[in-house]
């Protein structure tokens, strides 16, 4: 679609005569008829296939024609067309004399024609005017012409329609050749696709307007480049959404099980060495002189009653010292200077001489012991504490301090490792002699059933159109992360289909 424009500039008819040679009375009141048609090698009469236009009376005999385009007038003359400009044309311009005010062909005398010119040729679409002058024996016509495209039409033949827009269907202006030029912030064939915030992750982010960055499920951050870990993940991170990869020292599905109790809690006292031995479990190795589960108890070296023959024990910083009764000597008062004549046996013990009276031996009644029957029987000597329990004399009684995992008066009872429900996700716990064992339900594994081994919901490739599939660990279902231009739970719907789509 376009317009053929004809600008009449000057008409000369000095003698004021008609084509027949007859003079006009009182002068030639001149108007023009224009016929535009398809190219003809020899321009002949017939339909004006591209259009016609007539002017009012523009002057008498010789006159210049004012450019009237700015004032909404009729110069240049407009010949609009609604087809692809073919690049060639034929043009007929007739100058007529109007004796009266009626310019209709049928109202004019047959010899009212002043002059007639016919031209033909090639004409490309463009802004530049082509200047021409045609002379006959009596007249001269100077004019210029051009072809320009109508509003919203572009290209060499005015065949390309382009209407600038800034709405849901596109955001663009039109280039001189009719191609689209996207407005800032938009891209794509029809400039419908917003340019997201610079750096917005190509797969994990998207936008509905320019400079925006909206995150797809499982992603977060200004540029949607940070994954969201599994809900409830305590001491872990992710590299893809819904993961929970545990930090060092933590375990379990949610990384909430402490595997490094020693570092996190420092339970061992008095310079003891701590060793991790499982979830929330540890062992303290005490320095000499300390005992207890956490090495919190100071050990007295006199507790083992090292002094013999009634010697009394004194604790010292670097050990102990025995104070021997009369007649005894040695580190533990183990050497005697007595004989049976000195009645050395206490608590009803009977004395037997040895080595021709050089020394003796006491035979003690029940409940007494020692080389002189001076000691009550130490209830710990028979090592009554089972399972590695530590025996402690407490006056007339004794007690057993049990190792972790044992209880009872003599540490004879095995504490059930299953009592604290160590098996995750409904695993069944079995007590064993040296620990426990978990039998895991389907979908879980690991020493404590803490590892999820459920089926991969993405294995069946449920997502279409190059979408990324993620498994939601909490529901064992898939989540499809759609690329731009596709929607639906499986990214199965394109938001637009090209006009050439084979319906």
């Amino acid at each position: 679609s376009g317009v053929f424009q004809l600008q009449l500039q000057e008409f000369i008819n000095e003698r004021g005569v008609l084509a027949s040679g007859r003079p006009c009375e009182p002068g030639c009141r001149t108007f023009f008829r224009v016929c535009l048609k398809h190219f003809q090698a020899v321009v002949s009469p017939g339909p004006c296939t591209f259009g016609t236009v007539s002017t009012p009376v523009l002057g008498t005999n010789s006159f210049a024609v004012r450019d009237d385009s700015s004032g909404g007038g009729r110069n240049p003359l407009q010949l609009p067309f609604n087809f692809t400009w073919p690049g060639t044309f034929s043009l007929i311009i007739e100058a007529w004399h109007a004796p009266g005010d009626d310019l209709r062909p049928e109202a004019l005398p047959p010899d009212a024609l002043i002059s007639k010119i016919a031209i033909q040729g090639s004409l490309a679409v463009g802004q530049n005017w082509l200047l021409d002058e045609q002379t006959s024996t009596l007249t001269r016509l100077r004019y210029s012409y051009r072809v320009i495209c109508s509003d919203n039409y572009y290209g060499d033949n005015c065949s390309r329609l382009c209407k600038k827009r800034n709405d849901h269907f596109g955001h663009y202006v039109c280039q001189p050749d009719g191609n689209l030029s996207c407005l800032p912030g938009w891209t794509g064939e029809y400039c419908q696709q917003p340019i997201c915030l610079s750096g917005c992750h190509e797969q994990n982010g998207y936008c509905s307007k320019p400079a925006e960055c909206l995150c797809r499920p499982g992603w977060q951050g200004r540029l949607c480049n940070e994954c969201i870990p599994h809900n409830g993940c305590r001491h872990g991170t992710c590299s893809t959404p819904w993961q929970c990869t545990c930090d060092e020292g933590w375990g379990g599905l949610f990384c909430d099980q402490d595997l490094n109790y020693c570092t996190h809690h420092s339970p061992c006292k008095n310079g003891a060495t701590c060793s991790n031995s499982g979830q929330r479990s540890y062992t303290c190795t005490c320095r000499p002189g300390y005992t207890g589960v956490d090495c919190e108890l100071e050990l007295s070296e006199c507790d083992s009653n090292p002094c013999r023959n009634g010697g009394s024990c004194k604790d010292q910083e670097d050990g102990y010292h025995c104070l021997c009764p009369p007649g005894y000597y040695g580190l533990h008062c183990e050497h005697s200077t007595l004989s049976c004549a000195d009645s050395p046996c206490f608590n009803g013990g009977s004395c037997r001489e040895r080595n021709q009276g050089a020394n003796y031996a006491c035979e003690c009644p029940p409940n007494f012991t020692g080389s002189n029957c001076e000691k009550k029987v130490d209830r710990c000597t028979s090592n009554p504490c089972a399972n590695g329990g530590q025996c402690l004399n407490r006056g007339p009684s004794r007690m057993c301090r049990c190792r972790p995992g044992f209880t009872g008066t003599y540490c004879e009872l095995h504490v059930s490792d299953c009592a604290r429900n160590p098996c995750a996700h409904g695993g069944t716990c079995h007590d064993l002699e040296n620990g426990l064992m978990c039998t895991c339900p389907a979908g879980f594994s690991g020493r404590r059933c803490e590892v999820r081994t459920s089926i991969d919901a993405c294995a069946s490739s449920p997502c279409f159109n190059r979408a990324t599939c993620y498994t939601d660990l909490s529901t064992d279902t898939f989540v499809c992360n759609c690329p731009y231009g596709f929607v639906g739970s499986r990214c199965e719907f394109p938001v637009g289909l090209p006009p050439s789509f084979p319906w």
């Epitope: 069946s460 490739s461 449920p462 279409f464 929607v487 639906g488 739970s489 499986r490 199965e492 719907f493």
Partner: nanobody
């Protein structure tokens, strides 16, 4: 092979309402993903108006959000598009589309289309 038949199109004044229906053949209708596309002019792309996936999740084009509602009745093997507050720019041929799924593929089926004309 799935057959789709649309109905409910017609001429309506701006601000008025229409309800489009799409009846589908096939015994596994509830597992189909279904959508409405529209074609507004020759040479323009066919544009997704609304879609409902087999899991029931819905999606709408920005231009119709809040005005159009997509739904399905699995017992009647029919999908609907309730169109309220219609505008002249909603004038188009509306096509019903369904997708039937295999293990990792789907087949596309289209109806013949129903004309909706909104006059101002």
């Amino acid at each position: 092979e799935v057959q789709l038949v649309e109905s409910g199109g017609g001429l309506v004044q701006a601000g008025g309402s229409l309800r489009l229906s799409c009846a589908a053949s096939g015994s596994t209708f509830s597992s189909y993903a279904m959508g409405w596309y529209r074609h507004q002019a020759p040479g323009k792309q066919r544009e997704l108006v609304a879609a409902i996936s087999s899991d029931g999740s819905t999606h709408y084009a920005d231009s119709v959000k809040g005005r159009f509602t997509i739904s399905r009745d699995n017992a009647k093997n029919t999908m609907y598009l309730q169109m309220n507050s219609l505008k002249p720019e909603d004038t188009a041929v509306y096509y019903c589309n369904t997708k039937t799924f295999g293990s990792n593929w789907y087949d596309d089926y289209w109806g013949q289309g129903t004309q909706v004309t909104v006059s101002s």
